[in-house]
């Protein structure tokens, strides 16, 4: 009569995490008398998964009623199947011996693979704010996939990018996977409302792929650009020259106003106007009284935006000869002079 | 490149405990056996037991009664037991990495550590 | 347990000439999954054993290509086709099929 052959069909199976996988077994004969054992993985160190004999296996059920008269169907069916379980199972024939039972004849194998979804990608960005023209670097994290074939890209608003650089862990077998992504990317003045995706696409996701999202809003500082300017008055002994604050954002911005290096006021930016691309624009003005200085006045607008040092443009006030030979008497004459604006930041 | 580092006293007295530990740097313990090999003067190697990251261990039956071997994954080490010694358990001892694959098992102890001799004697 | 034997015990070489150690197994090493569960590994005067064949037949990392392991079931051969002076030491073979992991009694290569 044939010697007994140990029968494992499929030499893959392949299932997604929580469900159940069936492992098939047969075998050919009903002798010799011993124990069927299932292990995971083969040679030394290989883990029992279940034994006919004896012990308790609270996650395997047996396909068939194995002490059924005749019964040649060892398969067995492993619940709640987690990446961890993953492995080659090997359903192996046992020969009753004394004191133990000898390995008779095992089975090719059955490679249990388990599909398991990625977590929702995360993405960080920088810690600090950076001006347009500069890089900034984004990152994207997900865990605990499987099988390792992962695709990851990168999107600015809706546009794919190149620069980026990822790693899948560990680089050998593993139970499950991690993806890490760096993304760099360059700043421009009108990406206050621009965002940037990490999109993961995995077997598991059957075709619909998880995103993680990030604003640039969050990464980005436009400095403001300044204009002083002189606004006509009907007063002659009055001028209004007003700091035109444009283009900046984020909203912390305290602006102040010297004369001739003195300061004058300080003020908090609270109404601001909002452009299209996100960035604010405000106004601040100062009034000031020509009949009280004899001589040229040089008034300064400085604005400190997010904690970054302080820029500021300044502006030539002239005063009349008429007024500065007659000091504050004169109002009526008294002639306002703009000059060209003096830039200058510091 | 990952390096093993045996650690632990060179003299111990007869009856006493052994006590080794392995230190692992530049690598992971994850997905690895971890095992303990020792050397008696001037003969050959014998396997101790080793240990799965998971922390299932398996130990040679000739030793099995005085032998332990645990890990602790969170400082990269594991360590060896081994209780009652005698003269005949002065050897170098050798901690190693042994790779392992699900569906094949052990394919090679690859990284070995330099060894650390211990002495049994009063 | 697996009990594991070497020859020869001590074997004399001329550089450039090639050597070869027989190892056999009291059981067959070779299972279901057509592997054979043996390594072989050289121990350098004074250093740690180091790997240089797996699963009977694969060459571990980094090891020259003169060394070849052949063989299947209880039968295993080493071949060192061209022998150098680094490649002095003892050799010893490794049952990795079942626990307790056992080896051979290693064969001493020296330079005649």
């Known amino acids: 009569e044939d010697e007994l052959q140990v029968i494992q069909p499929e030499k893959s199976v392949s299932v997604a995490a929580g469900e159940s996988a069936t492992l098939r077994c047969a075998m050919t004969s009903l002798i010799p008398v011993g124990p069927i054992m299932w292990f995971r993985g083969a040679g030394a160190g290989r883990e029992l998964i279940y034994n006919q004999k004896e012990g308790h296996f609270p996650r395997v059920t047996t396909v068939s009623e194995l002490t059924k008269r005749n019964n040649l169907d060892f398969s067995i069916s492993i619940s709640n199947i987690t990446p961890a379980d993953a492995g080659t199972y090997y359903c192996v024939k046992f020969r009753k011996g004394s004191p133990d039972d000898v390995e008779f004849k095992s089975g090719a194998g059955t490679e249990l693979s388990v599909r398991a979804k990625p977590s929702a990608p995360v993405v960080s960005g920088p810690a600090v704010r950076a001006t347009p023209e500069h890089t900034v670097s984004f990152t994207c994290e997900s865990h605990g996939f499987s099988p390792r074939d992962i695709t990851l890209k990168w999107f600015k608003n809706g546009n794919e990018l190149s620069d980026f650089q990822t790693n899948v862990d560990p680089a050998g077998d593993s139970v499950s996977y991690s993806i890490h992504s760096t993304a760099r990317v360059v700043l421009t003045r009108g990406d206050v409302h621009s965002q940037v995706i990490c999109e993961i696409a995995h077997i598991t996701l059957q075709g619909d792929p998880l995103r993680g999202t990030a604003n640039l809003s969050e990464a980005i500082r436009v400095p403001p650009t300044l204009e002083v300017t002189q606004q006509p008055m009907r007063a002659e002994n009055q001028a209004n020259v007003t700091c035109q604050v444009s283009n900046f954002y984020p909203r912390g911005l305290q602006l102040t106003w010297l004369e001739n290096g003195n300061v004058s006021r300080t003020e908090t930016a609270s109404t601001l106007i909002e452009n299209k691309d996100g960035t604010y624009n405000w106004m601040s003005w100062l009034l000031v009284n020509t009949c009280a200085h004899r001589d040229d006045v040089v008034l300064t607008c400085q604005v400190e935006h997010d904690g970054q040092q302080a820029v500021s443009k300044s502006y030539a006030l002239e005063i009349s000869a008429h007024q500065k030979e007659h000091g504050s008497d004169i109002t009526h004459e008294a002639a306002l002079a703009p000059t060209a604006p003096l830039g200058g930041s510091g | 490149q990952v390096q093993l580092q045996e650690s632990g006293p060179g003299l111990v007295r007869p009856s006493e405990t052994l006590s080794l530990t392995c230190t692992v740097s530049g690598g992971s313990i994850r997905n690895y056996y971890w095992s303990w090999i020792r050397q008696p003067p001037g003969k050959g190697l014998e396997w101790i037991g080793f240990i799965y990251y998971t922390g299932r261990t398996f130990y040679n039956p000739s030793l099995k009664s005085r032998v332990t071997i645990s890990l602790d994954m969170s400082i990269n080490q594991f360590s060896l037991k081994m209780t009652s010694v005698t003269a005949a358990d002065t050897a170098v001892y050798y901690c190693?990495?042994?790779?392992?694959?699900?569906?094949?098992?052990?394919?090679?102890?690859?990284?070995w550590g330099q060894g650390t001799t211990v002495t049994v004697s009063s | 347990d697996i009990v594991m034997t070497q020859s020869p015990l001590s074997l004399p070489v001329t550089p450039g000439e090639p050597a070869s150690i027989s190892c056999k197994s009291s059981q067959s090493l070779l299972y279901s999954n057509a592997y054979n569960y043996l390594d072989w590994y050289l121990q350098r005067p004074g250093q740690s054993p180091q790997l240089l064949i797996y699963?009977?037949?694969n060459r571990a990392s980094g090891v020259p290509d003169r060394f070849s392991g052949s063989g299947s079931g209880t039968d295993f051969t080493l071949k060192i086709s061209r022998v150098e002076a680094e490649d002095v030491g003892v050799y010893y073979c490794m049952q990795a099929l079942q626990t307790p992991l056992t080896f051979g009694g290693g064969t001493k290569v020296e330079i005649k």
């Open positions: 190693a990495r042994v790779r392992a694959y699900s569906g094949i098992g052990l394919d090679g102890t690859d990284v």
């Open positions: 699963l009977g037949s």
